[in-house]
């Protein structure tokens, strides 16, 4: 699965969009969640409202919200004042039961805001206008096509 | 009428290889997953794996990976379950359904082929 | 993966008699995904209950469901003669998903 490489401003807020098959993933919830380390688990951070219907509701944990377009095969992840803990590998994933399928791979990376080395005086920007969807760098592996489930206890 | 309708009856000896079909009808074949479920002589249902035929990602049941393919062409609407090398164990009722994603996520099973039989026996 | 055991495995009841399945999960499963289905001998199996407890399109209220987390029950409130079956529940929770062994729903 390829890796989407977003770059965000200290402070600022990243958004996120993760686009996939509406009727293939019909009914099926939306999770964004933080890989821990190459061969670790992914924690859930938040996922989409627990009533499918109401998906398009933005739902919070923290500074991180996410709410989706279930119609248009959209789920959108923003981190807000973004942190340079924040940075790191995450994934968008749609849930199947509690089966969760990587919709994609997003590596996260927080630059640090030049004014902070400056005396800013009054400057700031409100949160809610700066949202920053940076660029991305594609990492192409295969896709495997045949996957069996994973053994559960 | 919505509906999947499957290939007849089968008999094969063992070591022989079979492909059976089931063909959708009466709506968009790539909007849904498609499940494959078997049911042998006197005993319950299992469930075998599943196939969205959009872009043919499927899925099995530990029990059944690397025992059957299932496979799908979308431009004849067919969804397909095959078997390279048969053995006395796979005689058994077949049968694919439809998966359908309910308005409240909700996942089931809601329209069913009719069977195909396939009995393997030297 | 979670085992579903449905009881009683024969029911024998009259026309007009209240039937109660049971259906437990060895680990809990969520309400949405558990489903009930029918089936009559030589016919493949017909969908009932999705959700735990919503109809399917074209069942009678007769039939109802309900039930959380581990146990879960299929209720026909006044058998009629087209009802005598085997009765499966199924899990899409955990994979892979699971069916019970089933109950058999015969005329006493």
């Known amino acids: 699965l390829n890796t989407t490489v977003l770059q965000g401003m200290a402070g600022q807020s990243l958004r996120v969009s993760c686009t996939y098959d509406a009727l293939k993933h019909w009914g099926r919830r939306k999770a964004w969640c933080r890989q821990l380390g190459e061969e670790g688990p992914c924690q859930r951070v938040v996922s989409t409202h627990g009533v499918w219907l109401l998906a398009f509701l933005k739902k919070r944990n923290g500074s991180t919200v996410i709410a989706d377009d279930t119609l248009a095969g959209t789920v959108t992840i923003t981190l807000k004042n973004l942190q340079a803990g924040d940075a790191g590998l995450y994934q968008c994933q749609s849930l199947r039961g509690r089966e969760a399928e990587v919709l994609q791979k997003v590596l996260v990376e927080v630059l640090e805001d030049p004014l902070d080395d400056q005396d800013a005086g009054d400057l700031w920007v409100p949160e809610e206008s700066s949202s920053f969807e940076g660029a991305q760098v594609e990492h192409s592996t295969s896709r495997n096509q045949e996957t069996s489930f994973p053994p559960t206890s | 009428e919505v509906q999947l309708v499957q290939s007849g009856a089968e008999v094969k000896k063992p070591g022989e290889s079979l492909k059976i079909s089931c063909k959708g009808s009466?709506?968009?074949?790539?909007?849904?997953?498609i499940g494959w479920v078997r049911q042998m002589p006197g005993k319950g249902l299992e469930w075998m794996g599943i196939?969205?035929?959009?872009?043919?990602?499927?899925r099995y049941s530990p029990s059944f990976q690397g025992q059957v393919t299932i496979s799908a062409d979308k431009s004849i609407s067919t969804a397909y379950l095959q078997w390279s090398s048969l053995k006395a164990s796979d005689t058994a009722m077949y049968y694919c359904?439809?998966?359908?994603?309910?308005?409240?996520?909700?996942?089931?099973?809601?329209?069913w082929g009719q069977g195909t039989m396939v009995t393997v026996s030297s | 993966e979670i085992v579903l055991t449905q009881s009683p495995g024969t029911l024998s009841l009259s026309p007009g008699e209240r039937a109660t399945l049971s259906c437990r999960a060895s680990?809990?499963?969520?309400?949405?995904?558990l489903a009930w289905y029918q089936q009559k001998p030589g016919q493949a199996p017909r969908l009932l209950i999705y959700?735990?407890?919503s109809r399917a399109t074209g069942i009678p209220d007769r039939f109802s469901g309900s039930g959380s987390g581990t146990d879960f029950t299929l209720t026909i409130s006044r058998l009629e003669p087209e009802d005598f079956a085997v009765y499966y529940c199924?899990?899409?929770?955990?994979?892979?998903?699971?069916f019970g062994g089933g109950t058999k729903v015969e005329i006493k």
């Open positions: 199924q899990q899409h929770d955990s994979s892979p998903p699971t």
């Open positions: 009466g709506y968009s074949f790539t909007s849904n997953w």
């Open positions: 680990q809990s499963v969520s309400s949405s995904y």
């Open positions: 959700g735990a407890s």
């Open positions: 196939i969205y035929p959009g872009d043919s990602d499927t």
């Open positions: 359904a439809r998966e359908a994603g309910y308005d409240y996520g909700e996942l089931a099973f809601d329209i």
